[in-house]
């Protein structure tokens, strides 16, 4: 058993049929010594008396808010949550496996630049009685500070018969050094509580590996005289790190017909313009990637050929 | 050329070669043997490699003030990785795949380090750790980790040379 926060405790249980459970001793936070009784949740049934209460925690029915009273007055509460371990593996029932980039990916994180600011998100099908708490640091043995905000519900989607909820959180490294080569990864820890179930999820990454620039901006076409060719131009996204002579992007320009089956013409360039042939009913798209480190490409910015 | 005395490197040549190094480091990564490393701990085996850190003057402002600190750091790293690529970590069993561009990567590391420090000039170089894994699978694991950290190192070096070519070239 360990304390998650004031008056909230997590009991770690090996979860299998007829498991013995864990013996837990609760102590009433009071100078009083006599006349103390204990109850669980809203029940008025007295579970025991005295300053301490010893219970055997085996299942969710044994978890909940234990309260000690004296003469009708509440003295203190202890909320017990359960953290299940099945076959040596901690349960992951609350969050959905996003399976990208690999199985058992519950947290996904992205950064738009090298400033030390990043966003993480996760998915669940649970709509009520759910709380999240997020902590982060750079490195684990001698952690350096990363400040995270509160997790918020950022999207709701319908997936078949199920509703899916997306939560996200923004974090900022306290003393970011955008130009340095990271040697210690960022660690992100999410505590999830659903009713009386506790779970924790972690992710470890370098900012450089989660970079995904915003799409190029101000995508424009300029027809070239007496030719089917057009000059496509664009600009770096506003959110990208500066100066651009240091934090450079590379670009992929694609000409795509209406039908997905049509041949795509692709050009790679480090410049912010390119000359391509504009086919009828086609569209021109441009996306960006860090020039020197192969993290994610941005989403496409597109304009129609006509 | 960035000689210890303090003259400027051939920024544009360094820019081209460092950008080439980035491509080679990425293209070599899947081709050093077959293995999924995602589950392996990253910290222990590669903390000995030199990193370009915050105080090394490799940020735009530090380069403007005095690029020598940064160039020396990059040079140390290049020599370090060049030695690793020539060691039995890469030459031993299991053999690199035939398609692997590690030979080009090795030659380019040496080429860039020579651009930074021509014969006859000497910056002190970092001691190469004795990373000598006994098992072939350990060697494979180490190759992956070395290439992963090399990718990060050459990315910073390439940014330095790109910025230098754009703003510090005479």
């Amino acid at each position: 058993i360990w304390e998650l926060k004031k008056d909230v405790y997590v009991v770690e249980l090996d979860w299998y049929p007829d498991a013995p459970g864990e013996m837990v001793v609760l102590t009433c936070d009071t100078p009083e010594e006599d006349g103390i009784t204990w109850t669980l949740d809203q029940s008025s049934e007295v579970l025991g008396s005295g300053k301490t209460l010893t219970i055997q925690v085996k299942e969710f029915g044994d978890a909940g808010q234990y309260t000690c009273h004296k003469g009708g007055e509440v003295l203190s509460h202890s909320l017990l949550l359960l953290h299940k371990k099945e076959d040596g593996i901690w349960s992951t029932d609350i969050l959905k496996d996003q399976k990208e980039p690999k199985n058992k990916t519950f947290l996904r994180c992205e950064a738009k630049n090298y400033s030390g600011r990043f966003t993480c998100w996760w998915l669940t099908t649970i709509s009520t009685d759910l709380t999240f708490s997020v902590k982060s640091s750079r490195g684990s043995s001698d952690p350096q500070g990363v400040t995270c905000g509160a997790a918020t519900l950022s999207a709701e989607r319908v997936r078949g018969d199920n509703k899916e909820y997306e939560y996200s959180v923004e974090c900022q490294e306290d003393s970011a050094c955008p130009a340095a080569e990271e040697s210690l990864p960022i660690e992100v820890m999410v505590d999830a509580v659903h009713k009386l179930k506790y779970e924790n999820y972690t992710s470890s990454f370098f900012i450089r590996d989660i970079i995904k620039p915003d799409p190029p901006k101000n995508l424009q076409l300029k027809p070239l005289k007496n030719s089917r060719q057009v000059e496509v131009s664009w600009e770096y996204p506003d959110t990208w790190s500066t100066p651009h002579s240091y934090f450079s992007l590379t670009f992929c320009v694609q000409v795509q017909g209406k039908s997905k089956r049509e041949k795509k013409d692709r050009v790679f360039t480090d410049k912010t313009s390119a000359t391509v042939i504009c086919r009828k009913n086609a569209s021109i798209s441009v996306r960006a990637q860090d020039r020197y480190y192969s993290s994610s490409w941005s989403e496409w910015a597109s304009v129609p050929c006509s | 050329r960035a000689v210890p005395g303090g003259s400027s490197p051939a920024w544009t040549q360094c820019q081209q070669l460092s950008q080439k190094l980035c491509t080679l480091a990425w293209s070599a990564h899947p081709l050093v043997g077959h293995m999924d490393l995602r589950e392996e701990g990253d910290e222990e085996t590669t903390n000995d490699v030199p990193h370009i850190q915050c105080g090394d003057g490799c940020d735009p402002q530090g380069l403007r003030d005095n690029s020598q600190f940064c160039l020396q750091r990059i040079h140390q790293g290049l020599i370090f990785y060049e030695k690793l690529l020539g060691s039995d970590i890469f030459t031993g069993e299991p053999s690199l795949l035939p398609d692997s561009p590690v030979g080009q990567l090795h030659a380019s590391l040496l080429g860039l380090s020579q651009l930074l420090q021509p014969e006859g000039h000497h910056w002190e170089t970092q001691q190469i750790p004795s990373l000598s894994p006994s098992q072939p699978w350990q060697r494979l694991l180490l190759r992956f980790k070395i290439l992963r950290s090399l990718q990060a190192f050459v990315a910073v070096a390439a940014r330095v040379f790109a910025h230098g070519a754009a703003t510090l070239s005479p």
């Epitope: - | 293209s27 081709l31 035939p98 398609d99 561009p101 590690v102 030979g103 090795h106 030659a107 380019s108």
Partner: antibody, heavy 116, light 107 residues
Framework: QVQLVQSGAEVKKPGASVKVSCKAS????????MTWVRQAPGQGLEWMGQ????????DYNEMFEGRVTMTTDTSTSTAYMELRSLRSDDTAVYYC?????????WGQGTLVTVSS | DIQMTQSPSSLSASVGDRVTITCRTS??????LAWYQQKPGKAPKLLIY???TLAEGVPSRFSGSGSGTDFTLTISSLQPEDFATYYC?????????FGQGTKVEIK
Amino acid sequence: QVQLVQSGAEVKKPGASVKVSCKASGYIFITYWMTWVRQAPGQGLEWMGQIFPASGSADYNEMFEGRVTMTTDTSTSTAYMELRSLRSDDTAVYYCARGGGGFAYWGQGTLVTVSS
Amino acid sequence: DIQMTQSPSSLSASVGDRVTITCRTSENIYSYLAWYQQKPGKAPKLLIYNAKTLAEGVPSRFSGSGSGTDFTLTISSLQPEDFATYYCQHHYGIPFTFGQGTKVEIK
């Protein structure tokens, strides 16, 4: 299994251009360098250049003085080698080969004949 | 550019003979050397890479050795299907260069 299938033989006039294609299958195209090698009749092998499909980054043998361009179409896993300002001594079999080191897989070769 | 000097340029041998072909480079190429076999009208076939590693499907009578600037391809017992032209190629930095070839003929 890995296969590289090249376009058919070409006959060109001096000064013209030729574009040879190499369609790859059986592997992840963008992960490997594609190299072009040529062999004049009765002669040895000559490295022309290489391209990395994931980024479009290419390197050329200086011998070809800017006459060669290598491109890839990742949507069809096809590599192209275009040689311009053809001369009679460009008559050769042109091969694509996978990789940026030793070449374990080769195309069947494309004979380009330059003759007036 | 790295120069490759292959010798001999041709040799005559009988089935069962031990054949050795050498390749010398103008500068240190570590172990980044490949050997190919080519038959008329066919693409080259990779035999050895990284100086000593046998490519997939290549008979064990072929072996490679050497590092730095001096390399050797050995065929321990020549078979009828081994009569062909053999090339060495370095893969240490570009441009890659090939040796001029060694033609192995029937005595």
